[in-house]
């Protein structure tokens, strides 16, 4: 509530706004009859410097002139850019207990003169928009700086707008609020920006433009697509544009794509036919416009139209495989399997599959539709059977794929040779083979088929397979390959009416098994011991078991045990050994071996043979 400058005045020379690097003199003068009562000679004027409301310096030592009791002049130097506050206070030295009294204050602004504005750019958004220009102001001046944008054109057209920059706002764009119309298309316009502050002024170079240079059309709107006769590959894209647009750019892509298809359309008048679309595919469409074929700017891209193209009937052929097993004395069960079409072949949502099993000679035909990718039927074991499958969507069905049902492993002469399986990495296996040696009919193709060596449902866990051309002798299998699981792999060689196959086991990664086989019984028959066991549970095998080892040693013996190594066969669960002495108690146990090493031992069993030894 105090009148801060009641006691005196503060003045600045040369001015309260100074260029960076300049010094200033600040004079503090007491008004008549103001000051310390009774003792004018005890008046002491001090000057305090504040930056951002924080006291940073007492300029007592910067006095350059002192009129005792009436005025003091202080020189200030090295002022930083921006505003600095100086406050003059009166200190009555005879009264040590009273704080100094404010006399008056002054703000000094340190800045620079404006640089000439550069890079002027003007735009008018749409035919009915207004001209707005932006520029680069150059270095910050730290002072309030006024900018004036002036436009001049034909027919004595002049227009100007102003704005200012200070420490709270920046002025580098102005909308003139005028509209340039297409009838001025050939006319030239000049704009200039002038900057002025307390330390100087500057002007930009004149910037000349035409209507076409600065008018950016509005992006097209109301985009839609019409598919001709519900076609999935042909459609007419339609949109609304400003009246003067002569050129459009269209871009479109499937939603999961990373590259756009680009099309330029001249005088399209809001309509363009697309002929290369993929059926049943989510697309994104965008359009941009230009007012002139050679000059002018493209509009921003329109908002995206996202839509799915209609379905078309499936193309391509299904990849079919089958499994057959004798079900009783005169019937066999045929399980057909097929792979789903990829989206570019399905060209729609597959509603069902049409399956046909036909006996060639008797013309018996079994037909059915299924939504699954497998189908099982029991048929007579006699006769030559063929199967076909086609996929159907709402627009139609694919051409049926045919396969002859032959005994897949029936012809030894067609069995591929030297089949091997090598683990390539964690999730694939390289299978190689040599062609059949004495095939009496040409190999049309190889099928590499694999199944996990784990119990599974025949229909719920279909086989995995790859079709290989007849001149290839290797396949990298990766579908559904998991580490630490053993797979049985079959390589089939197929001719027109016969099949031969060879099997091998393989894994993509292996560890030593978790445990050894469990010995369930030891029996003595005709001077031989038969060891019976249960196999290691599948999850504990951790890869393909190569062989089992049966160990034995005399009870309480510290000697190394003897061992017998047996090739692993899943169908085998007992083995004879014949080198044990009668009436000696032995301890027996078993281990299992994968390519990674040997398991810990299984359970121990004691046995004392009774019969005559070898």
């Amino acid at each position: 509530n105090i009148d801060v400058c009641k006691l005196g005045t503060v003045t600045v020379q040369p001015a309260p706004v100074i260029p960076l690097g300049s010094a200033a003199n600040i004079s503090c003068s007491l008004n008549p009859k103001q000051g310390c009562s009774h003792y004018p000679s005890s008046n002491e004027l001090i000057l305090l410097k504040f930056v951002n409301d924080v006291l940073v310096e007492n300029l007592h030592g910067k006095k350059v002139h002192d009129h005792t009791g009436h005025s003091s002049t202080f020189q200030v130097t090295n002022l930083s850019l921006g505003m600095t506050l100086f406050v003059c206070k009166l200190n009555c030295s005879n009264s040590q207990k009273k704080p100094p009294v404010p006399v008056c204050g002054v703000e000094i602004s340190v800045g620079v003169a404006p640089e000439p504005p550069q890079n002027i750019s003007c735009v008018q958004e749409g035919e009915n928009g207004t001209v707005a220009c932006s520029w680069n102001s150059g270095k910050v001046t730290y002072l309030k700086t006024n900018y004036t944008l002036q436009l001049s054109g034909p027919n004595n057209l002049t227009c100007q707008k102003q704005c200012f920059s200070d420490n709270r706002q920046n002025c580098n764009r102005l909308d003139l609020g005028i509209n340039l119309s297409p009838d001025l298309a050939e006319s030239r316009f000049i704009v200039r920006v002038t900057a002025i502050n307390d330390l100087g002024n500057s002007s930009s170079l004149p910037h000349t433009f035409t209507f076409l240079d600065i008018v950016i059309p509005l992006p097209p709107w109301d985009i839609r697509i019409n598919f001709l006769n519900a076609s999935g590959s042909r459609g007419t894209l339609q949109w609304e544009d400003e009246g003067q647009v002569v050129l459009n750019q269209l871009r479109y892509q499937p939603l999961n794509s990373t590259s756009w298809n680009m099309v330029n359309a001249t005088n399209a008048k809001g309509k363009y036919d697309l002929r290369d679309l993929r059926p049943f595919t989510e697309y994104e469409f965008q359009i941009s416009s230009k007012l002139h074929l050679s000059g002018g700017s493209w509009s921003n891209w329109s908002e995206s139209l996202r839509t799915r193209t209609p379905e078309e009937e499936p193309v391509g052929i299904l990849d079919i495989w089958y499994m057959k097993q004798d079900i009783d004395y005169d019937r066999q069960q045929i399980s057909l399997f097929w792979k789903s079409l990829n989206p570019s072949e399905a060209r729609g949502k597959i509603l069902h599959y049409q399956v046909t099993l036909q006996e060639v000679t008797k013309k018996t035909t079994l037909q059915n539709t299924t939504r699954h990718t497998s189908w099982t039927r029991v048929i007579p074991r006699t006769g030559a059977w063929t199967a076909s499958v086609s996929a159907a969507n709402s627009k139609g069905a694919s051409a049926p794929t045919h396969i002859n049902i032959v005994d897949l492993c029936g012809t030894g002469l067609l069995a591929p040779h030297q089949v091997s399986a090598k683990s390539e990495n964690m999730d694939n296996i390289l299978v190689t083979w040599q062609p059949p040696k004495k095939a009496d009919s040409a190999v049309r193709e190889y099928i590499v088929e694999w199944r996990a060596l784990q119990p599974g449902s025949i229909t719920k866990f279909p086989p995995h397979w790859l079709r290989i051309p007849p001149d290839n002798m290797s396949a990298l299998i990766s579908e559904n390959i998991k580490p630490y699981i053993c797979y049985e792999i079959r390589v089939h060689a197929l001719s027109e009416s016969q099949g031969g196959c060879s099997s091998i086991r393989g894994d993509s990664k292996h560890k030593a098994p978790v445990s050894g086989p469990h010995i369930t019984a030891i029996t003595e028959k005709k001077e031989r011991l038969f060891i019976s066991w249960t196999h290691i549970p599948f999850p504990e095998q951790r890869g393909c078991i190569l062989h089992y080892r049966i160990y034995w040693k005399e009870r309480d013996s510290t000697a190394q045990p003897e061992l017998c190594e047996i090739q692993y066969r899943r169908s085998q669960n007992s083995h004879p050994i014949s080198s044990l002495q009668p009436r000696v108690t032995y301890v027996l146990w078993m281990t299992a071996v994968t390519a990674a090493g040997e398991s810990p031992q299984g359970n121990e069993r004691e046995f004392c043979p009774q019969g005559k030894a070898n």
């Epitope: 097993q325 299924t370 699954h372 497998s374 189908w375 099982t376 199944r451 996990a452 060596l453 784990q454 119990p455 599974g456 449902s457 025949i458 229909t459 719920k460 866990f461 797979y487 049985e488 079959r490 099997s503 086991r505 899943r570 169908s571």
Partner: nanobody
């Protein structure tokens, strides 16, 4: 191992009905494909019907339309509803389960239940 137990057989007049049941126990986590077979005196065992994991069923031609196979997964059971029975349906009926390990098919059989169709 998998154990299968049939029940529901008996003596029935021609044109009558019976419902056979088969309950599985043991390591049945991969048993999805279930079958009924039968063996008449002096004849070979023959397939009657099966049901797959996806409930797809198939029948011997001579029983198609009269017999219906179904399953109740919660009870680990499979059933054979036999209607319009004929004397030639007289046989021991066996429940069968198949599973595949690699390319080898493992089969499990029940003890059988006698069905006699006679007036």
């Amino acid at each position: 191992q998998v154990q299968l137990q049939e029940s529901g057989g008996g003596l029935v007049q021609p044109g009558g009905s019976l419902r056979l049941s088969c309950t599985a126990s043991g390591s049945i986590f991969a048993i999805d494909d279930m079958y009924w077979y039968r063996q008449a005196p002096g004849k070979q065992r023959e397939f009657v019907a099966y049901i797959t994991a996806t409930n797809s069923a198939n029948y011997l031609d001579s029983v198609n339309g009269r017999f219906t196979i179904s399953r109740d997964n919660a009870k680990n059971s499979v059933y054979l509803q036999m209607n319009s029975l004929k004397p030639e349906d007289t046989a021991v009926y066996y429940c069968n389960a198949k599973q595949i390990v690699g390319f080898q098919i493992d089969e499990y059989w029940g003890q059988g239940t006698q069905v006699t169709v006679s007036s």
